[in-house]
């Protein structure tokens, strides 16, 4: 048995008459055989729902459902109501009815086995009939909507007549209807004004009634007719078996150069036409099982389920429905030697389901896991400035298709021919798996022996020893100029074009910094900055090189704080920046401020 | 009110250690980088050591480079300077001083009353 | 390293008089100067920021000016407070060295 509401709304006037009924309340069953008996719990509660008073006013029917006063609530009985309401005026009270044989402890009320009464009090006598506008003779000011359990016995669920009304002014003639298209499930009685349902409802058909009550009242020679909606909810049980849409139970996957855990292999899609089991007990509910085959592939492959609510299309209307996702999940890194095919089962299970048929499904991945061979081209030529600062990023190695590598983990290494000439260091991108070279020692690039750099680049796949092999070329260019003495570690410092342009600092190609102008359009990612090379730094991600030292590029490293407009990167640096930012890296900080239309020194000169 | 008590100082021989310590209050601490200021008898200031905020960074003067080491203790409220291998030339009053940055660099806005420092035989 | 170069190094002056004294970078520190005064057996005192901000409570006869490698420091009517060293600073690049300081003397 089950409530088809959790809340209902009277009102209650001070000392309206001891028998007066005040409403109907309805219970719906999920079995034909069910016989509904409605018991009242023992106390009125307040607000906040603070315990009042013993419930010694308000009684029920047991068989019917029929609330009604027992006897009147006088000005005393409210005033003493009143005083427990932790201060607060008292102007709602509320019981809860309990479905027998629901064995509900007082303190809880959830539907579907109990519903809360509510009633509005008047501190006033029920109003004279004729003073009753049309609104208050046909429905509660509250709007009630209804649940119904599909698949269930059809019953009664409302009554329409407001009962306090009826007794007290019984020469006004209250008459209703249900405005509904044709062929719906639901009646109105004319005589007892009961509104039932006509057969048993399926949610998978329409979810949702928004119908319209219709009540036309007579006094005297006066006709008025009230309109409210009246929507029903039809409340969804597990009545639908899984499906492939469109018949596809079979996924075929490569695995080749993706070969990180956690990577996504391949996906099938499975559609259920339900939305139970809700989403806290889903997983749990609904089971996926990689079946045994391959100890590798247990091993290998893992199976995640990501649900989904969907809507479909349903006798020209949406239903919710849910969609999962198996998920051929990478288990671990694949090694680039690994070779095998094979096909995997997964057994889908909605174990809420109770038929007909069978809520299993049996998912196919058809794996191919390829190896990978390393290979770099055979030479490398590259330049290098005299006047490069150590950190300057001076150029890339990747083995082939490197870009597209995860899980891969290639390390680059330099073998110098020349001893005393070792200018170049190599680290490895974990982004693309690709290696950057940069100037590691720049008293070797000063040294005029040292014009050119030979240097064997060797890439090797940490997990097989695997290796590959080229030719790096470094052809040193320039003359060396000493660099400005007293100019700042970092080029971030510098805050105006001129004073960048002027100075060196840590990362930068040409022993110069190098001055990026912003587009000036509020807090921008292109905001103005000095920098030692506007290719790597600020580009929103602090790379692998400039993250050997703070001073090389704080604007997409720094993790301290930015003060001025700004929006911080993620994890770090500063994402976006109003006017121009510039940083102290030694202490973890960064300004953005508005560019300076005016040097100080101008200011002087000008006076 | 924004208060730097420095304490440690003392009288030590040439090749000694010695760690001064600095007890702030009225400010945020962790927010804020910290210096190590040094002034000899009848000199002029010297800028020592310097600490960021989180601790994670610090750097030094050249003239005691490898010798000093600046640390903080963040929940403790305390800033460090601990010295070995003292000289005669290390003889000063050394002061903490709390950094305080604008776009055009650090500025010492509060400073500790300072601590002698003696380095002789 | 950058050198700071302050002067005069000494200076005598009667109070209510207008007092300039002047620093000078080795190369261009652009706007990255700070001024400071300390009185004897006491810690230095912020007095300039940025070449030209004044530190909140300083008095406003306090004022710096300059850009790039001069700068000066003007008391624009001298208390007797104000007989003590003046200290400049640059913060554009470590060392952030210190000027040697200019006595202010009553005449």
């Known amino acids: 048995l089950y409530f088809s509401r959790d809340a209902y709304w009277e009102k209650l006037y001070v000392d309206q008459a001891a028998g007066t009924p005040l409403l109907y309340v309805h219970a719906l069953r999920d079995a034909p055989e069910e016989v509904p008996s409605f018991r009242l719990g023992q106390h009125l509660y307040g607000t906040y729902r603070t315990r009042l008073h013993e419930n010694n006013w308000i009684c029920i029917q047991e068989d019917t459902g029929l609330l009604y006063l027992n006897r009147s609530l006088d000005h005393s009985s409210w005033e003493k109501l009143s005083v427990r309401n932790r201060g607060f005026p008292l102007l709602t009270v509320y019981l809860k009815v309990f479905l027998s044989p629901t064995s509900l402890r007082e303190g809880e009320c959830q539907w579907p086995g109990c519903a809360r009464v509510y009633f509005s009090f008047f501190n006033t006598s029920f109003p004279a009939c004729s003073s009753l506008k049309p609104r208050e003779l046909c429905f509660p000011e509250t709007r009630p909507s209804f649940r119904i359990r599909e698949n269930r016995p059809p019953g009664t669920f409302h009554q329409f007549r407001l009962l306090p009304v009826q007794f007290l002014c019984p020469n006004i003639s209250v008459a209703y209807r249900l405005l509904e298209g044709e062929g719906l499930p639901f009646r109105c009685a004319p005589d007892s004004l009961e509104v039932s349902t006509r057969w048993a409802l399926d949610r998978e058909q329409r979810e949702k009634y928004e119908l319209v009550a219709v009540c036309t009242v007579h006094a005297g020679a006066r006709e008025e007719v009230v309109m409210v909606p009246f929507p029903v909810t039809v409340y969804d049980e597990d009545d639908s078996a899984p499906t492939f849409p469109a018949g596809v139970d079979t996924a075929s996957a490569v695995v080749e150069f993706k070969r990180k855990e956690d990577t996504v292999v391949a996906t099938l899609r499975v559609f259920d036409a339900d939305v139970v089991p809700a989403s806290g007990e889903l997983v749990r509910r609904y089971t996926s099982t990689l079946l045994p085959g391959d100890t590798w592939a247990q091993q290998t492959f893992r199976v995640e389920h990501w649900p989904n609510e969907t809507s479909v299309q349903a006798n020209g209307s949406f239903v919710r429905a849910t969609v999962h996702d198996y998920r051929l999940v990478l288990n671990r890194n694949l090694s680039i030697s690994e070779n095998r095919t094979m096909q995997l089962a997964v057994l889908v299970n909605d174990s809420d389901f109770q038929g007909p048929g069978a809520g299993v499904l049996l998912l196919h991945f058809n794996v191919s896991v390829l190896p990978v061979s390393l290979h770099l081209p055979s030479t490398y030529s590259l330049s290098v400035s005299r006047r490069a600062r150590r950190f300057a990023q001076i150029g890339k190695v990747c083995v082939e298709n490197c870009q597209a590598f995860s899980g891969i983990n290639v390390q680059y290494k330099l073998h110098s021919s020349g001893a005393n000439c070792s200018t170049l260091g190599v680290v490895t991108s974990a982004e693309d798996t690709s290696g950057i070279l940069f100037v590691n020692d720049t008293k070797a690039l000063r040294r005029p022996k040292c014009a050119e750099l030979h240097y064997m680049v060797v890439a090797t796949d940490q997990q097989t020893s695997r290796q590959a092999q080229a030719q790096l070329l470094v052809t040193v260019e320039g003359s060396y100029v000493a660099e400005e003495a007293g100019c700042p570690l970092s080029c971030a410092v510098s805050k105006r074009r001129l004073e960048c342009e002027e100075c060196g600092g840590l990362g930068s190609p040409t022993g110069r910094c190098e001055w990026r102008q912003g587009d000036g359009k509020g807090i921008t990612r292109n905001f103005s900055t000095c920098s030692p090379s506007t290719k790597t730094c600020p580009d929103g991600h602090c790379d692998v090189v400039e993250t050997q030292d703070i001073n090389i590029c704080p604007q997409d490293c720094l993790r301290g704080s930015i003060v001025g407009g700004h929006e911080p990167g993620e994890p770090r640096g500063i994402k976006a920046g109003y006017g121009t930012c510039n940083c102290f890296p030694e202490e973890e900080k960064c300004f953005c401020e508005p560019e300076d239309i005016q040097d100080p020194l101008c200011d002087e000169l000008c006076r | 009110e924004v208060q730097l008590v420095e304490s440690g100082g003392g009288l030590v021989q040439p090749g000694g250690s010695l760690r001064l310590s600095c007890s702030v209050s009225?400010?945020?601490?962790?927010?804020?980088?910290m210096r190590w200021v040094r002034q000899a008898p009848g000199k002029g200031l010297e800028w020592v050591s310097g600490i960021s905020g989180s601790g994670g960074i610090t750097y030094y003067a050249d003239s005691v480079r490898g010798r000093v080491t600046i640390s903080r203790d963040n929940s403790k409220n305390t800033l460090d300077l601990q010295m070995t291998n003292l000289r005669a030339e290390d003889t000063a009053v050394y002061y903490c001083?709390?950094?305080?940055?604008?776009?055009?660099?650090?500025?010492?806005?509060?400073w500790g009353q300072g601590t002698l420092v003696t380095v002789s035989s | 390293d950058i050198q700071m170069t302050q002067s005069p190094s000494s200076l005598s002056a009667s109070v209510g008089d207008r007092v300039t004294i002047t620093c000078r970078a080795s190369q261009s520190i652009h706007n990255y100067l700070n001024w400071y005064l300390q009185r004897p057996g006491k810690a230095p005192k912020l007095l300039v920021y940025a070449a030209s901000s004044l530190q909140s409570g300083v008095p406003s006869r306090f004022s710096g000016r300059g850009s790039g490698t001069d700068f000066t420091l003007t008391i624009s009517s001298l208390q007797p407070e104000d007989f003590a060293t003046y200290y400049c600073q640059q913060s554009y690049s470590a060392p952030y060295s210190f000027g040697q300081g200019t006595k202010l003397e009553i005449k």
């Open positions: 001083a709390k950094a305080e940055y604008s776009s055009s660099g650090a500025y010492f806005d509060y």
């Open positions: 009225g400010f945020i601490f962790k927010n804020y980088a």
